[in-house]
Each structure stands twice: as C-alpha cells, then as structure tokens.
C-alpha cells in the first residue's frame, strides 16, 4: 500500500555470543531523504510521549551525532535506499527485536527485525537426499543460518571423525532474502559407507571447533556375500561330499531370495544358504557361486572352482596321420579324461607293451612297414589307472618289395 514505507530484509537473523551480525536491508521512504535514524533494542511505543522507548543502539540525526559507546553498531546505509546494519561483536542480550526508527522530513516509520543470539555457536544442519544408493553420486548439504563479513567461518565434512577426501563447494548468502553459509559435498557412497557417521563441523577461521551436526548414512545396496567351502581347497574325489555356505556380510534392505549358480546357470531347488553336494560326480566340477537378492537387486559371491578328481577314463588314440607313407613321420596321442591330469602312460602295439614309452605323445620319425597295426594306451594318475580303449589302426603304405614273377 502506498501509505507505507517499503522494507526488504531477512525476517530473523541468527548469531551467537561474540560473533557478529550483518543485516542486509533496503528501503523506500514515502517522501524525500532520510533525516534521522535510530536503532532500538526491544522498542515499545509510549502513548504518553508519542515516542518509542527502549535501548538506543545507534543514533544518527541531521547533526550526525553517534553515541561513542556504540562503535560496535554500524549503520551502513544511506538516505534513500540502503538500511544495512552491522553489530560486531554481538552479545547474548542483543537478542530480541531490533527497531529501525526512520524519519524523513514529513514521515516516520518503525521497522522491526528479529535477532536471535545464542550463548554458544548453534549447529549447522545436514540435509540428505531421500535415498542414497551405492555407487550413485549424492550431494550432502550442510546449512548454517549465519554469515557475517567480520567473522569468517568454515564448514568441514568428516566421515567417522576423519576429514572427507572429496571436494566441497562452499557458498555464502548475505542478501535481503536470506543469510546463510552452505557447504555442498558430492561423493559416490559405497556399500561400506552404510551406517557410518557423517559430520558437518562448524569451525572458525583458525579451524577451531564451534559446533556440528551428525547423520548416519543409510546406503541402499545389493547383498554383499562371502562363500565358504568344505573342504577349503574345493578339491574332492568322486564320491566325496562337498558343503558350500553363503554368508551375507551386508544387505540394505534385508535380502529376500537365495539361489545357487553353477557355471552361470541357476541350480534348481537350491534356495538355502547351504549347498550340500553328496557323492559328487565328475560332471559336478565347475564354478559355483551364491546369489542373494534384495529390493535393490541381486548380489553375487565370488566364484568357487570345484574340482572333482577321478581316475582316468578309458583312453583313445589319435594318429597323425593314417594312412602313413613309408619313411614319413607319425605322431600318436593318448587321450583320456582325468583329474588331475595323467602323469604316466603305457603304450601298446598290437597288444604288446612298447618299452620306454611313458609320455602322452609317441613320435616315430621314420615309419617302416612293420610299424603298421593297432595302437592303444593306458593313462594313469594319482587316483588310479584307466582302462585300455579300443585303440587306433595305423596303415603304412609302401612300394612293392621283393617282386617275384610267377
């Protein structure tokens, strides 16, 4: 309304004993320039005198007189727009209402601003996003309803009492709309941050502690798992039993389902934290892991490589190459599935053991006709000796020998 002076400033300002208060303020008088300004503390209107009573913190008239004891209060304004004030230092008993008594040539106005001065530095306030999820960056905000040019402060972030390594952005506002100091820290929380305490610490310019606020991080994450196997080396013999246990070291929220995977494929009807494999066979060798899910998603354990050891299976012989031409070279390969791998081989030619041949491969550099026939082998490992397989036939081609005419 046009009959009022127009003021803009924060409604309430906050400070603490010994700090300072900076009051950003603008105004528009009804007519002409400001001629007199008095800053009252808790002003009360006296109907008898038609004047305001209260402690005068600052006075400025046409004569320019300022009470000498009020050097801590400064009017930083002007005669037509700016009514900014500074109180440095500010004291506990400055709390209450500040009254800005303004007078122009023909008009008067009393503008009230609330001042809240606490005994000790009040804590900042940490603001967290509604949900924090592992590996998704979040911004933590620390807000303090205080800023003053004459009293530098800093906000520091701590994780479990140790300064955080991530960089923060600190901003201050000293405007007619708001007065605050804010620190924003962006970081990528990991599951291990769940339950940890984050602190925003208010410090003076020298790093001295003034106050703080703390929050406990609630980091949503997939289940974190540990897999244990008995025996611990995951090496067993055919017919033995194996037990695998899945342990949830952390899950937020709680887990809902459990499953086991072998070589990436889900094992049917295995939905408990223990996987019992009785009388294992060699086909049960492979990579096992457990998978536990919660509302965030599935978590997988590390893989355990189960080795089921068995004696060599009946062996087969591969010949490179048959038929072979006399004088060429030939290689025989004994093939037998076994775990561990065979360490010894026995070779047979036409059912008769070949002396001195104990390797997986037999190499004949120069084939002769008498080398023709059936070759078989037997593989052996620490668990036993395999059976001799059917063998392979070597055919040797050669030119006619001892030609006789009939």
């Amino acid at each position: 309304d046009s009959s009022k002076w127009v003021f803009e400033h924060p409604e309430t300002l906050y400070a603490w004993e010994g700090a300072c208060v900076w009051i950003p303020c603008t105004y528009r008088a009804l007519d002409g320039d400001l001629e007199s300004f008095i800053l009252f503390h808790n002003p009360e209107y006296n109907k008898n005198t038609s004047k305001f009573d209260g402690t005068r913190l600052y006075e400025s008239t046409k004569d320019g007189k300022v009470p000498s004891e009020q050097k801590r209060v400064q009017f930083l304004g002007d005669k037509n727009k700016n009514c900014t004030l500074s109180i440095h230092p500010v004291h506990l008993n400055d709390s209450g209402q500040l009254g800005l008594r303004m007078e122009s040539k023909t008009e008067k106005w009393m503008e009230r601003i609330h001042l809240n001065v606490s005994e000790r530095p009040f804590p900042p306030h940490i603001q967290l996003p509604p949900e924090i999820q592992e590996s998704q960056e979040v911004t933590l905000t620390c807000l303090l309803n205080f800023s003053c040019y004459g009293y530098p402060i800093q906000l520091q972030w701590l994780l479990e009492g140790v300064p955080m390594r991530q960089a923060a952005v600190t901003s201050t506002s000293l405007t007619i709309k708001s007065v605050f100091t804010r620190s924003e820290l962006k970081f990528s929380p990991q599951w291990s941050h769940h339950g940890k305490i984050v602190t925003c610490q208010l410090q003076d310019a020298d790093g001295k502690f003034l106050s703080n606020d703390t929050v406990q991080l609630n980091v949503k994450h997939t289940p974190k798992l540990e897999i244990k196997v008995t025996p611990s080396d995951a090496i067993v013999r055919e017919g033995d039993s194996v037990t695998m246990t899945c342990e949830v070291s952390s899950s937020n929220p709680e887990y809902t389902t459990v499953s086991w995977l072998k070589d990436g494929t889900s094992l049917k009807k295995q939905n408990t934290f223990t996987l019992n494999l009785r009388e294992v066979t060699k086909d049960q060798s492979g990579k096992y892991c457990c998978q536990v899910s919660n509302d965030v998603g599935p978590g997988r354990s590390e893989e355990v490589f189960l080795q089921v050891q068995y004696a060599p299976e009946p062996s087969t012989v591969q010949i490179l190459h048959s038929p072979a031409v006399e004088g060429s070279q030939v290689e025989f390969l004994c093939m037998s599935l076994a775990n561990p791998l065979p360490t010894n081989y026995t070779w047979y030619h036409n059912g008769k053991e070949m002396q001195g041949r104990t390797e997986e491969k037999v190499h004949i550099p120069k084939i002769l006709p008498w080398h023709a026939g059936t070759y078989s082998c037997v593989a052996e490992n620490i668990l036993g000796t395999g059976q001799r397989g059917p063998g392979a036939e070597l055919d040797v081609q050669y030119p006619p020998k001892k030609v006789t005419t009939v």
Epitope: S135, Q136, E137, Q154, Q156, P163, M164, R165, Q166, A167, A168, V169, T170, K186, F187, S188, Q190, G207
Partner: antibody
Framework: QVQLKESGPGLVAPSQSLSITCTVS????????VHWVRQPPGKGLEWLGM???????DYNSALKSRLSISKDNSKSQVFLKMNSLQTDDTAMYYC?????????????WGQGTLVTVSA | QIVLTQSPAILSTSPGEKVTMTCSAS?????MYWYQQKPGSSPRLLIY???NLASGVPVRFSGSGSGTSYSLTISRMEAEDAATYYC?????????FGAGTKLELK
Amino acid sequence: QVQLKESGPGLVAPSQSLSITCTVSGFSLSRYTVHWVRQPPGKGLEWLGMIWGGGSTDYNSALKSRLSISKDNSKSQVFLKMNSLQTDDTAMYYCARPHDFDAGGFAYWGQGTLVTVSA
Amino acid sequence: QIVLTQSPAILSTSPGEKVTMTCSASSRVNYMYWYQQKPGSSPRLLIYDTSNLASGVPVRFSGSGSGTSYSLTISRMEAEDAATYYCQQWTSYPLTFGAGTKLELK
C-alpha cells in the same frame, strides 16, 4: 590394468570448437569419476572439470561457459568439448582418474593430446 | 578458489642431499597431493592424502603438513628425481594445482 588414452584433432583454428575423446580400460565409467586437466607448453596444470559415475558434471567456473563433458559408458569413452578456442587454449589435454572412486589424487593419467590453436 | 603457492620455484641440489619443497594454501585444506612430472611425460602421483606414498614410489619421498602448510621431502636426492613437482588440493572446487617447483641437479 587401468588405462586412459586421449585422442584429439591436434590443430584447431581460433574461435572454433575442440572435441577430445578419452578411451578407458580396466575400470567401469559407471563407478569412477574421470577428470580433464590441461597444461599449456612450459606452464603448470589446470583442472577443467569432471564427470561422475552417474553422469553429472562439475566444471572449473572460469571455463564453465565454454566446456561440456559427457560420456558413453558402453564404449568406455569420455568426451570433452570446448567452444570458442583462443591461442591461450593451446595446451596438452589430459584425462585422469582418481585413486578412489571420486577422490584421493589422480593416480592414473592418459598420455595427453596436444592441441594447438592457430590460424 | 584456493590458491596454492609453491616455493622455491627452482631448486638446485646435488645427489645424496636432502630436498624439501613447500606448498602454502590460501585457506585450510584437508589433504595435499603431490605429483612429479618429467619433460614429455604425464604427471605421476607421488603422495596422496598428505603423507601416503602412491604405488611404486620410492620410500625416499615423504609428505607432511596440515591446515595451510604442506611439504614434500626427498631424503636423498637421486639423478632420476630431477623433475617438476606440483602440489594439488582436493578440498574445494575448483580443484587447484600449485605452479610447480623445478628440481634440478647441480
């Protein structure tokens, strides 16, 4: 192992824009931040900006109006785009990854790509 | 932004000597990071979190400091240590580097 490699145009005309690609291996761009740092010949290092695992960015305020950082997680590539280049933008441009997910010093650097701004 | 001032700008020393260079911050930082750079190469992280040695860095390098004052020390200078050393802060955006200390062999 962790590796980063920059590739750029080499020569850029004044007032034109610059595009550099950083191709990474040995880690996931969806989990780690990647930063851009430049170094004019014979001078010191200047941090340009960064891209977070989730894709949000932070820039050096002095260059913010000219910079854009983006990425393609599936191709393991991070892109730096800079507009209105002047001769004082001539520098070696590096991409770097911190020790941790988002902090801890630049433990991994690319070999750098030299960008010369000249007519 | 936080300004990091390194001193001295140039340092000449002989093999076997102890070398100390400093980095002063315009406002308090939580941790300091140190890099070594040789001509034609990318920077190499030497020290992280003020005093921790990065992987593969010889134990003759050490870092210390707090608040606004930090230092990098080489207990016994070796010929291969001749390089430019940069400090860097990770407390406030924008991340900033010092102008560098050039370490030369006498």
